[in-house]
């Protein structure tokens, strides 16, 4: 119910979170769960817990396996796991695909390429960035804030892209790279004032208390490469990442189609385990780009399990 | 929807001992821990302790861990708060509650409707 | 165990004033709950997590403070903000309450 998979390379720093959420005051405690042994918490190890988080610096083959957190609220534990896998850095320029993390689209008007998991480390700008292996240069390439801008993009843009970054630990610097794909959608077209497809306006869903449950924001901007378009949720007018219910994600990226010729974006909302609260929350499927924004609300219901007689 | 719903009050003798019920509905009654919380005129509110329904587990005030005991059905999604060893100290409105977000610690957001225990001879 | 203390322990207000009530903690808290409670009902959350609004609460009221000194504002007082509020730390066990204020309407 609570574990997460991470995975990094020897010699990297990695960072993982914990799984399972608690006020930033709560105590938590790292345990490696084969031995039961406890993750120290002082900064000179070189695997060490420090809250929330769990920080290989650098990480190694051996560190490999589930790791237990324990959130210490007032009243009771609450326990999570995070799965690590360490892997050997590879000889050549092929990044396998385990070490990929979710494959973005971008077009000839909107090619940002997001670093993975950046958000977890202390680094500083400017990023850099690999195709295949090779050190992007020229003009058409900006490395701006956590993500890679490529100007007048075309299909041949396609491929693997790597960000390197330096996280740095009490003066100590540390290499971390994540690779994920890019894809490019190529085609001449127009934009117009953004058409939610999914869900319709004001559309009650029904769901299961106690099961999983998906909502796909869809909207459509018009026809071929659009430029500045987005979709994105919110719950109560509050934005995914900062409500602060870790049951309640949005899908990483956004997925991009193409519907009878127009460009199209989709934005999965998933509820984990939902729970009665859930029902007396607003979700909101917002669509915008340059034209404007356009918003469909959506509530959920509660739907019965049928009862199966035998 | 959430409901906590409470049994009846109570007219107990001194010395005795009454349980009093909490059945939940509209959630996953494993999923949360449920607290119960003692209110009278001269001591306000006091938190008693607190269950967690999956495991059994419990945490008590101090105060009245010779007072009480939490236990919890899951069968019937039903939690209970025996009170033991009544004196007149002991009358009072005896609440169910939980918390909105279980691992948020986020107040009490679901209280019943309360149960009134008369302690008197 | 954490000691809350409330004050004032009564108060009165005229519609439209602007009404301030404290809740001192004996040690640091991380976070202040505040509770409503009217005669013959149960407390209703009101206030979480120091200034978050609880559904249906009226946006005229509003909660700050940190370590050990809290409060709960009303910015314009209407004749149904008349109850007793009780604030409330879930820093550490025991969870622990105010005594509570009670607020009149003048």
């Known amino acids: 119910k609570f574990s997460k998979q991470s995975w990094g390379l020897e010699n990297e720093a990695l960072i993982v979170r914990c799984p399972r959420q608690g006020k930033p005051s709560y105590t938590v405690d790292w345990y490696y769960s084969q031995t039961n042994k406890s993750i120290p918490t002082q900064e000179r190890n070189r695997v060490f817990a420090s809250g929330q988080l769990l920080k290989f610096l650098p990480a190694a083959v051996a560190d490999s396996g589930i790791y237990t957190c324990i959130v210490r609220s007032p009243t009771f534990n609450r326990t999570g796991y995070a799965n690590v896998t360490i892997y050997k850095k590879q000889s050549d320029c092929n990044v396998p695909d385990y070490l990929m993390y979710s494959t973005v689209s971008g077009s000839e008007k909107n090619s940002k390429i997001y670093c993975p998991t950046i958000d977890l480390y202390n680094w500083t700008a400017p990023l850099e960035w690999f195709k295949n292996c090779q050190a992007l240069q020229g003009s058409r390439y900006r490395a701006h804030k956590s993500f890679l801008v490529i100007d007048n993009v075309m299909t041949e843009d396609a491929g693997d892209y790597t960000c390197k970054f330096i996280h740095n630990e009490n003066g100590a610097n540390y290499s971390v790279t994540a690779t994920r794909s890019f894809t490019v959608k190529d085609e001449q077209g127009f934009s117009l004032f953004p058409v939610i497809g999914a869900p319709a306006q004001n559309e009650i869903k029904e769901v299961e208390i106690g099961k999983n449950a998906n909502l796909t924001c869809s909207a459509c901007f018009g026809k071929g490469t659009q430029f500045l378009a987005a979709v994105l949720w919110q719950l109560n007018g509050t934005k995914i990442t900062d409500f602060g219910e870790p049951r309640i994600q949005q899908e990483e990226g956004q997925n991009q189609s193409f519907s009878n010729g127009l460009a199209c974006l989709d934005m999965v909302l998933r509820i984990a385990d939902v729970k009665e609260e859930d029902l007396l929350l607003q979700y909101d499927c917002l669509a915008l780009n340059l034209h404007g924004l356009r918003r469909h609300t959506v509530r959920l219901s509660r739907k019965n399990p049928i009862d199966h007689h035998s | 929807q959430v409901q906590l719903q409470q049994s009846g009050a109570e007219l107990v003798r001194p010395g005795a001992s009454v349980t009093l019920s909490c059945k939940a509905s509209g959630y996953t009654f494993t999923d949360y821990e449920l607290h119960w919380v003692k209110q009278t005129p001269v001591h306000g509110l006091e938190w008693i302790g607190t269950i967690d329904p999956e495991t059994g587990d419990t945490v008590y005030n101090q105060k009245f861990k010779a007072k009480a005991i939490l236990t919890a059905d899951k069968s019937s999604s039903t939690a209970y708060m025996e009170f033991r060893s009544l004196t007149s100290e002991d009358s009072a409105v005896c609440y169910c509650?939980?918390?909105?977000?279980?691992?948020?610690?986020?107040?009490?957001?679901?209280w019943g409707q309360g149960t009134l225990v008369t302690v008197s001879a | 165990q954490i000691v809350m203390t409330q004050t004032p322990a009564i108060m009165s207000a005229s519609p439209g004033e602007k009404v301030t009530m404290t809740c001192s903690v004996s040690s640091s808290v991380s976070y202040m709950h505040w509770y409503q409670q009217k005669s013959g009902t149960s407390p209703k959350r009101w206030i979480y997590?120091?200034?978050k609004l609880a559904s249906g609460v009226p946006a005229r009221f509003s909660g700050s403070g940190s370590g050990t000194s809290y409060s709960l504002t009303i910015n314009n007082m209407e004749a149904e903000d008349a109850a007793t509020y009780y604030c409330q730390q879930w820093n550490s066990s025991p969870l622990t309450f105010g005594a509570g204020t009670k607020l009149e309407l003048k």
């Open positions: 509650t939980r918390a909105f977000y279980n691992d948020y610690d986020d107040g009490f957001a679901y």
């Open positions: 997590d120091t200034s």
